[in-house]
């Protein structure tokens, strides 16, 4: 059997750091047994077997001119093996940090912090930890270890399906290379970690007879289970083309009747989630959806209380009296509190 | 000789922007992450961001989240600061800084002061 | 964020004392704790990296010990180019963080 050690990588590769002392171990002789070292297609004998050092050619202060192929000889002048050299680093702890899109599962990436030069894997695990008793601040024994699963294909990213939402767990991404492993834990809530996807399916609609309204509408992105009790609120933002500033609005539900829209130009729209109770962070932007408001015909029936906004063209104070706002019901909310210089407008 | 340096400092008006550059030589650039580290006058140091060797995680300070970010070009071994939206407690001595292991800030620059007056 | 705490703010010592700094930080942060040295006008320059170990060209009157919380740094016999701000800095998490600093002026 062979003398040298088989470091994690591939077959017939030894590995050394620069600037350091490295050791080379003739694979196909018996410990201690002496041999002679050459660099490949050179004659120069770069150790003898007289060295003391047996199996062994050490290169003091390796440098990148040290890379490269070695041969190692018996004393019958017999083939022990080659070797390649190849310098690089121990790893440093990677980079990590993780995201989840829903409250059941969260995928986890890792970036190097440092490139090693060497080839490198990534083990990836977690626990689940547990707090003891209501009052407690102590945590038990984790449980686990369980394998986070990496992706195919080499990208570095694993995903823990099946997650607790009011659980705290400890990912574990250890780095490993032909000279070492290094470790970086981080904690993770899925509380804090929750991002939704963007909302889907924006659209933005005039009304008719209305120049100064748009309704917007979306739905749950497609990644969020569809259970009662963990629900998503929205914001949303709309701005005339041109104009820099936008506009924002918490809707109650998947729709949102803009009242203040500038009549006869283009706005742009678009909506944000988060979940219901504030846990995590809100979302990206979905992409701008476009509409502009109708040139505005007077609809053919009026709702009887908008006979109340008679009031001169200005807009009604902040406590104003305003119609109940219905939270998730599908039908249109054609008039609202915003209503009244846009309705004196319609009706004159 | 291994060494990074700064520069784009200067004065700005609160509000206003500012880039600045750190030149690497002497090593290996893209094998390393990069870090800013800034002083305000007569203050203590205060981690700003850091980015990792590729370029895909990034990492900032709360003081500064979403107003600065923090990019590299590996190709002229340059490390990069889009300050915007200035404030005047930016005012500080920015250093550019190489880390091993994500924190361990082993090589600065001189560093390049910014002033966040009007 | 981890919180780091350095003890005393300033001193004043004779040439050739013994001087320790103390740094304590909000949580357990292994060993993964720094020192730094800063002269006015300069940059920082790294000691001691990991808790105790000396980075290469460092005098060896410098050294530091501690894990966990609870870090000490010491200067064996302090010279006059020791005149400096003395920072600790953690790296457990990704969001490093320095103490306040420590001046330390002779006698």
């Known amino acids: 059997s062979s003398p040298c050690p088989q470091a994690w990588g591939p077959p017939g590769v030894q590995y050394g750091q620069p600037g350091r002392s490295v050791k080379l171990c003739c694979p196909g002789v018996t410990a201690g047994d002496p041999v002679s070292w050459f660099r490949d297609g050179e004659p120069k004998l770069l150790q003898g077997p007289d060295s003391g050092l047996g199996h062994e050619l050490v290169l003091a202060q390796a440098d990148s001119t040290d890379e490269g192929t070695y041969i190692c000889q018996t004393l019958d002048g017999a083939l022990g093996g080659t070797v390649t050299l190849q310098l690089g680093y121990p790893p440093a702890r990677p980079v990590v940090s993780c995201q989840a899109a829903d409250y059941e599962n969260f995928s986890c990436t890792w970036s190097p912090s440092q490139i090693s030069g060497l080839p490198t894997r990534y083990l990836t695990s977690y626990r689940k930890k547990t707090v003891l008793g209501a009052d407690s601040q102590r945590r038990s024994p984790s449980t686990g270890p369980w394998p986070c699963p990496q992706d195919p294909l080499g990208a570095a990213r694993c995903v823990v399906h099946g997650a607790e939402f009011w659980s705290q767990y400890r990912i574990n991404v250890t780095e490993v290379n032909p000279l070492g492993a290094s470790t970086r834990l981080l904690d993770v809530s899925l509380q804090s970690i929750l991002r939704p996807d963007p909302p889907q399916g924006l659209r933005v609609e005039s009304v008719p007879g209305y120049p100064r309204r748009l309704r917007a509408s979306w739905t749950y992105p497609a990644s969020w289970p569809c259970q009662p009790h963990f629900l998503l609120k929205f914001r949303l933002q709309y701005r005339p083309a041109q104009h820099p500033a936008w506009s924002t609005v918490e809707p109650a539900g998947l729709e949102e009747v803009i009242t203040d829209a500038v009549a006869g130009l283009p706005h742009a729209v678009r909506v944000s989630a988060r979940d219901f109770l504030d846990a995590g962070t809100w979302s990206t932007w979905s992409p701008e959806a476009w509409g502009t408001p109708s040139t505005g015909t007077i609809p053919k029936e009026i709702p009887a209380w908008g006979q109340l906004h008679t009031q001169p063209e200005v807009e009604p104070q902040v406590d104003s009296p305003a119609p109940p706002r219905p939270s998730l019901q599908p039908h249109p909310r054609l008039l609202d509190h915003r209503d009244s210089v846009e309705q004196v407008a319609v009706l004159a | 000789e291994v060494q990074l340096l700064e520069s784009g400092g200067g004065l700005v008006q609160p509000g206003g922007s500012l880039r600045l550059s750190c030149a690497a030589s002497?090593?290996?650039?893209?094998?390393?992450?990069m870090t800013w580290v800034r002083q305000a006058p007569g203050k203590g140091l205060e981690w700003v961001s850091s980015?990792?060797?590729?370029?895909?995680?990034?990492q900032y300070a709360d003081s500064v989240k979403g107003r600065f970010t923090i990019s590299r070009d590996n190709s002229k071994n340059t490390l990069y600061l889009q300050m915007n939206s200035l404030r005047a407690e930016d005012t500080a001595v920015y250093y550019c800084?190489?880390?091993?292991?994500?924190?361990?800030?082993?090589?600065w620059g001189r560093g390049t002061l910014v002033t966040v007056s009007s | 964020d981890i919180q780091m705490t350095q003890s005393p703010s300033s001193l004043s010592a004779s040439v050739g004392d013994r001087v320790t700094i103390t740094c304590q930080a909000s949580?357990?942060?292994?060993?993964?704790l720094n020192w730094y040295q800063q002269k006015p006008g300069k940059a920082p320059k790294l000691l001691i990296y990991?808790?105790?170990n000396l980075q290469t060209g460092v005098p060896s009157r410098f050294s530091g010990s501690g894990s966990g919380t609870d870090f000490t740094f010491t200067i064996s016999s302090l010279q006059p180019e020791d005149i400096a701000t003395y920072y600790c800095?953690?790296?457990?998490?990704?969001?490093?963080?320095f103490g306040p600093g420590t001046k330390v002026d002779i006698k």
């Open positions: 800084a190489k880390p091993h292991d994500w924190g361990l800030f082993d090589l």
């Open positions: 002497g090593f290996t650039f893209s094998w390393y992450s």
């Open positions: 980015i990792v060797p590729s370029g895909g995680h990034t």
């Open positions: 949580q357990d942060i292994n060993n993964y």
């Open positions: 990991d808790a105790s």
């Open positions: 800095q953690q790296y457990d998490n990704l969001s490093p963080t």
